[in-house]
């Protein structure tokens, strides 16, 4: 495939998992999608962190609209030379994108790890942190959390979609600056009727 | 097979203090929720606290809150219990129990309990 | 705190009867996330308590089908089906929904 199609294949794809991660983590802000938790102090460290907001989302969202750019055609100075230009960007942009992916994981992972913030017999705290993830194997206990209502399976859900939204942005990233170096140096594969003139 | 052996129980003066331990064997004691639960000489049951599987958190009733410490070993399968200003009223049978679970939950193992009395 | 209460304090039974008995706390039991955690334990002479039942209606392993719990809200009841010589003892019901947990006062199962 061309670096140029590839290119823009790989930036959809992030920009669609950027639009996951907000929401996930939109989400995560509203357990059992009540809002009266929103303002106290009864949700998770993780879920204030927003990785999925600004790690796999803002951070991500850079090399997915640079990716889709280098996969363009014009606009940054005319045909090879504008689109090595754009390939560059998006190297830089790339990498950009796999900081912010591995800070989503390494939140989200953290967040499925130590479980959520709960009231568990009348005590405010991370009452799964203890089990060291062991808790995700057993659901009987998940219903000893009194409040936020349901939250155990929200936060595991969510932050379990975090972290795959998030591997699989490290692995797009990763795929898009190998993509892009190579386009850096041998330009792009398409013909010269299809450059603008 | 799960085996809870308990130790430490004896006489002591009314203010005194105890440790009772409880030594597990037969299970990973490091992913079960434990508790002490005592039987007064009227054969009433009475929980006196809790701890979870790591240790990070314990639960008490009012009676017995600040006086006695719930402590676990993981590394060491066992469990404690360190009872100060002891009263008349925590005369006896004391009892170390799993819970089915990191937290609380039902007592599916108990110990053979270990008599504590208080008095002058 | 919630205080149960258990009738009657001895039920005296013949073999091979059914024995019923009554467990009642003074504010329900139901825990916020739907489930009642109500237990049933028995505690047979010179022996620990031995779980018998757990959230409300069931039986631990190994426990007999003879064996059954009911009831919702404050109203609890074990019933055992057909009474056999090694079902005797002292029977308590416990809550733990709410700290803190309570057990009952115990009802003494014993041959008429």
């Known amino acids: 495939m061309c670096t140029g199609k590839c290119a823009r294949c790989v930036g959809l794809s992030l920009i669609t998992l950027c639009l996951v991660c907000i929401v996930a983590n939109a989400l995560l802000l509203v357990p059992n999608g009540e809002t009266s938790w929103t303002n106290t102090n009864h949700l998770s460290l993780q879920v204030w962190l927003m990785g999925g907001f600004i790690g796999g989302g803002l951070m991500v969202l850079c090399p997915g609209i640079a990716a889709v750019r280098a996969g363009g055609k014009g606009c940054c100075g005319a045909g090879c030379c504008g689109n090595r230009c754009r390939m560059l960007r998006s190297v830089f942009s790339s990498a950009f994108g796999v900081l912010g992916a591995i800070y989503c994981l390494s939140v989200s992972g953290a967040g499925l790890r130590n479980g959520p913030r709960c009231l568990m017999n009348g005590e405010w705290g991370y009452h799964f942190e203890d089990t060291a993830g062991a808790y995700l194997l057993n659901r009987t206990l998940w219903d000893r959390c009194e409040a936020p209502p349901r939250v155990v399976p929200w936060n595991v859900t969510l932050f379990s979609l975090l972290v795959a939204a998030s591997c699989l942005e490290i692995v797009l990233c990763g795929i898009q600056l190998v993509n892009a170096t190579i386009g850096v140096f041998c330009g792009d594969c398409r013909k010269k009727q299809d450059t603008p003139h | 097979q799960v085996q809870l052996e308990q130790s430490g129980g004896d006489l002591v003066k009314p203010g005194g203090s105890l440790k009772l331990s409880c030594a597990a064997s037969?299970?990973?004691?490091?992913?079960?929720?434990m508790s002490w639960v005592r039987q007064t000489p009227d054969k009433r049951l009475e929980w006196v606290a809790t701890?979870?599987?790591?240790?990070?958190?314990?639960y008490y009733p009012d009676s017995v809150k600040g006086r006695f410490t719930i402590s676990r070993d993981n590394a060491k399968n066992t469990l404690y219990l360190q009872m100060r200003s002891l009263k008349s009223e925590d005369t006896a049978m004391y009892y170390c129990?799993?819970?089915?679970?990191?937290?609380?939950?039902?007592?599916?193992?108990w110990g053979q309990g270990t008599t504590l009395t208080v008095s002058s | 705190d919630i205080v149960m209460t258990q009738s009657p304090l001895s039920l005296p039974v013949s073999l091979g009867d059914q024995a019923s008995i009554s467990c009642r706390s003074s504010?329900?039991?139901?825990?916020?996330?739907?489930?009642?955690?109500l237990e049933w334990y028995l505690q047979k002479p010179g022996q620990s308590p031995k779980l018998l039942i757990y959230?409300?209606?069931n039986r631990f392993s190994g426990v007999p089908d003879r064996f059954s719990g009911s009831g919702s809200g404050t109203d609890f009841t074990l019933k055992i089906s057909r009474v056999e010589a090694e079902d005797l003892g002292v029977y308590y019901c416990?809550?733990?929904?709410?700290?803190?947990?309570?057990f009952g006062s115990g009802t003494k199962l014993e041959i008429k």
């Open positions: 959230k409300v209606s």
């Open positions: 504010q329900s039991i139901l825990h916020s996330s739907g489930n009642t955690y």
């Open positions: 037969g299970f990973t004691f490091s992913s079960y929720g």
């Open positions: 416990f809550q733990g929904s709410h700290v803190p947990f309570t």
């Open positions: 701890i979870s599987s790591g240790g990070g958190y314990t």
């Open positions: 129990a799993r819970h089915e679970g990191f937290t609380t939950y039902y007592f599916d193992y």
